[in-house]
């Protein structure tokens, strides 16, 4: 029961996490910035992995994709790749984990197969979560580096002067969504791996315990003498003769005070 709960909870947590990773990847608010200010109007900028938007205090909003831009930062491409890999792995993990769920019966699938699938999906969720966390962290680092490196300077360019303007920027909501979602996916993956251990059938050999009558080489199977409950085939407390068979781990057995004579 606990295994099923752990597996189910791991699946749900991972599902929420992957949905969050997808949401973060699609969101425009990876970073926000004040681009322009005067006493009448202010221009805010929010940037995502795929496009950048400007919003003015007047209500005007315009978004533009980066496909028009040459020389995108290599780090941005790396972040995109990490997020997409995270989504793909997470999606495959979800698909695998659906079939691995203990509460779902598919044909005559054995517990060992379900255990293997649970472990596979768990590992996929862990890697997916790590990809998302890494992607978001790389982006945050890129932001901090780029903004602090471009200190206010002025130089002469073609047609006049060029000046880098110092503006205020903040981490966007998508960064926090990505970090939380990555963490949830990671936790879900760990839970699936834990559930896998409980699903795996243990190699347990229930060996018969032999009881010896003193001086005789007779072994009795457990239940040879049953209490008179009226249940079972041996209601008359007859001895069940075993032909002197012994279990392989039992080389020699000595009579004790617990032996039945």
């Amino acid at each position: 029961m606990a295994v099923t709960a752990c597996q189910g909870l791991g699946f749900v947590v991972s599902l929420i996490g992957i949905a969050g990773i997808i949401a973060a990847t699609c969101m425009d608010q990876w970073s926000t910035q004040d681009l322009y200010n005067n006493p009448v109007t202010a221009v805010f900028n929010y940037q995502g992995l795929w496009r950048s938007c400007v919003r003015e205090s007047s209500g005007f909003t315009e978004c533009r994709g980066y496909f028009t831009l040459l020389g995108l930062p290599a780090m941005l491409q790396a972040v995109r790749a990490l997020m997409i890999v995270g989504i793909v792995l997470g999606a495959i993990g979800l698909l695998v984990s659906i079939f691995a769920l203990k509460c779902i019966r598919i044909g005559s699938m054995e517990d060992s197969a379900k255990a293997n699938m649970t472990l596979t999906s768990g590992i996929m969720f862990i890697v997916s979560g790590l990809c998302a966390i890494a992607g978001v962290s790389v982006f945050a680092n890129m932001l901090v580096t780029n903004f602090w490196m471009s200190t206010a300077n002025m130089y002469t360019g073609m047609g006049g002067m060029v000046q880098t303007v110092q503006t205020r920027y903040t981490f966007g909501a998508a960064l926090f969504v990505g970090w939380v979602a990555g963490g949830l996916t990671l936790i879900g993956g760990v839970m699936m791996c834990i559930a896998c251990r409980g699903l795996a059938p243990e190699e347990t050999n229930y060996k018969a315990v032999s009881y010896h009558a003193s001086g005789h080489s007779v072994a009795y199977k457990p239940g040879g003498f049953k209490a008179s409950t009226g249940f079972g085939s041996n209601t008359k407390n007859k001895k069940i003769y075993d032909g002197g068979a012994r279990t392989e781990d039992e080389v020699q057995s000595y009579p004790s005070k617990h032996d039945y004579v």
Epitope: Y36, V43, E56, E62, R64, M142, F147, V162
Partner: nanobody
Amino acid sequence: EVQLVESGGGLVQPGGSLRLSCAASGSFFRIVAMGWYRQAPGKGRELVATITRGGSTYYADSMKGRSTISRDNAKNTVYLQMNSLKPEDTAVYYCNVRVEVPFMQPNDYWGQGTLVTVSS
């Protein structure tokens, strides 16, 4: 790199009108705001008027009511229509463009300046 080409400056009589234009060209992501600044002889550079991409305008008190700023987003051009000019409006007028640079600080580009002389 952004190139700014200013035009429309010259000599004008007091009370006259003048239309300045500034065209931006080159490779850039997006122009956020465009504007005009001026620098009179022996003085610092001061704002005349600015216009954002969405069309919000701002005018300095000295030019309020006497000037109109407009822009053509498709052509990346800004215009400054100045009316009722006074001798104190004599200055070098500079075009200013603020360009968005994704994942970096924005850049301000300045034109070479066009001289406006108000004299009889």
